[in-house]
């Protein structure tokens, strides 16, 4: 806390500019008016403050907006929105979708803050869901945002916003997510034909069930091993040699390489040796010839 | 006047760890920043993070994210380097350097301590 | 990330000379760039901030100049305590990039 002191004679400050990088920590106090300070804001980020000078900046502020800073400030705090706790911004109304670009801007290119998680809680919840916008935003400059998001928070996620979603920005998430991001992206897709269908579906198939996958398989869609090995293993285990042939296409000899991995690994030992020796690729571990395979979850099901 | 002295240094096998100190005297510790940089033997200064004077921002260089943390302890006047998952391309001079503000250059640096990673 | 590049790499120059080197940033720093001059087994050493502001104690026959991407660092009468590598580098918020180097020889 800095102590409350006279300003010397003709240090008064008129404006926000670099001769107050030579003021002592109580001048700055006592000779810069809050009210200045908010209104030129913008010129912060042009003057090489040092940290104490930045402490005592944020304390006046403080002092003028004990309720938090209106948004005016807000989208004009550059540098010394490094300096906010998350208590600070969760004081804030934020709103514009500008003041929420500026802020991450000053955070670019490193991992998401406690400031920066918070700031985009306050955003969203203030919006109500995450429209296409936001989302938009938020993934250019956070790749993994959507995956940091729980299952509940992805439920919020029009489909319509599933349009801003590129293929890395689902890196990272699990099943889970991906359970309830596909319904959304499968709605959004609706519309378009198979093989654009597919290049824009693709990325959220972790979340696809069976028979979603038994229809894209009569599709020629040549799915890669990549996105293979991500689908959900219960949903590939029903699948036909066939079926996973089709789904493939030329990308079926990649099941050799993969077949100590799951899903492949489990899918196999569902199949019939016979037909997984019609594929040519060696692939062993199938159910001999003469054995009869009961579905035990059927007969669970059933009694 | 401003001094600054690393230690911490020596030869560690790839995969281990290693903690970095920075002591430092004739400032006001708790008021600036702290950053520390490397130099492999024969190449150029590499930036590697910084912490700020309160401590709770921390930014680090690409090459040692989620590998590498930095931390302080304002009470004790030090900074710290751990360094996890060491790799042979981690070999190099680390130097503490300090700067005053988000705009500021840095002005201090300690003679550095050398790291050697090598099996 | 801003990257730096600095040119030439080595410099070869006489006691008296007046030498040049020039840094580029692959996007506008305005004029937050530094200069460092190191000696072999030494840190660096500050001569230059803010583009163009000598730091304290050092020898007014350093100057540099430039803002936004190109900047330039000059020696204006060599002497033999200036045959060293330097260095440009940005500096921002949150980061710091330097260039790799320029080393200034004896010819």
């Known amino acids: 806390e800095v102590e409350k002191t006279a300003c010397p004679s003709g240090k008064k400050a008129r404006e926000i500019d670099e001769s107050l990088i030579f003021y002592k920590k109580w001048e700055l106090e006592a000779c810069v008016d809050a009210a200045l300070l908010a209104t030129q804001m913008d010129r912060v980020n042009a003057i090489p403050f040092t940290y104490e000078q930045l402490d005592v900046l944020k304390h006046k502020l403080d002092e003028l907006y004990p309720q938090g800073y209106p948004e005016s400030v807000i989208q004009h705090l550059g540098y010394l929105f490094l300096k906010m706790s998350p208590e600070d911004i969760r004081k804030w109304n934020v709103t514009s979708l500008e003041t929420l670009k500026a802020l991450l801007e000053v955070n670019k290119g490193h991992e998401m803050s406690p400031q920066v998680a918070t700031l985009i809680d306050r955003f969203v919840k203030g919006r109500g869901q995450l429209d296409k916008d936001t989302l938009d935003t938020l993934t250019a400059f956070y790749p993994g945002y959507l995956c940091s998001l729980s299952p509940e928070e992805l439920s919020s996620v029009p489909p319509s916003s599933i349009w801003a979603v590129r293929p890395q920005d689902l890196d990272t998430c699990d099943p889970r997510q991906l359970d309830v991001l596909y319904p959304k992206a499968r709605l959004a897709f609706q519309n378009m034909n198979g093989s654009e269908y597919f290049v824009k579906i693709q990325s959220f198939l972790g979340g696809a069930p069976t028979e979603d996958l038994k229809a894209l398989s009569q599709q020629n869609v040549s799915m890669d091993l990549a996105t293979f090995m991500k689908l959900r293993t219960d949903a590939v285990l029903p699948l036909t040699v066939a079926e996973v042939q089709k789904l493939l296409g030329p990308h079926v000899e990649g099941l050799k390489a993969e077949e100590r991995h799951r899903p492949v690994r489990d899918w196999i030992l569902r199949q019939r040796q016979d037909d997984l020796d019609t594929l040519g690729l060696g692939l062993q571990g199938g159910i001999p010839n003469g054995y009869l395979v009961l579905d035990l979850s059927m007969q669970e099901a059933l009694s | 006047q401003v001094q600054l002295v690393e230690s911490g240094g020596g030869v560690v096998q790839p995969g281990r760890s290693l903690r970095l100190s920075c002591a430092a005297s004739?400032?006001?510790?708790?008021?600036?920043?702290m950053n520390w940089v490397r130099q492999a033997p024969g190449k150029g200064l590499e930036w590697v993070a910084v912490i700020w004077n309160e401590g709770s921002n921390k930014y680090y260089a690409d090459s040692v994210k989620g590998r590498f943390t930095i931390s302080r302890d304002n009470s004790k006047n030090t900074l710290y380097l751990q360094m996890n998952s060491l790799r042979a391309e981690d070999t190099a001079v680390y130097y503490c350097?300090?700067?005053?503000?988000?705009?500021?250059?840095?002005?201090?640096w300690g003679q550095g301590t050398l790291v050697t990673v090598s099996s | 990330d801003i990257q730096m590049t600095q040119s030439p790499s080595t410099l070869s120059a006489s006691v008296g000379d007046r030498v040049t080197i020039t840094c580029r940033a692959s996007?506008?720093?305005?004029?937050?760039l530094a200069w460092y001059q190191q000696k072999p087994g030494k840190a660096p050493k500050l001569l230059i901030y803010?583009?163009?502001s000598l730091e304290s104690g050092v020898p007014s026959r350093f100057s540099g100049s430039g803002s936004g991407t190109e900047f330039t660092l000059t020696i204006s009468n060599l002497q033999p305590d200036d045959f060293a590598t330097f260095y440009c580098q940005q500096y921002n918020a949150y980061s710091r990039t330097f260039g790799q180097g320029t080393k200034v020889e004896i010819k």
């Open positions: 350097a300090r700067d005053r503000g988000p705009l500021w250059p840095l002005d201090y």
């Open positions: 004739g400032f006001t510790f708790s008021s600036d920043a």
């Open positions: 803010k583009a163009s």
């Open positions: 996007q506008s720093i305005s004029r937050w």
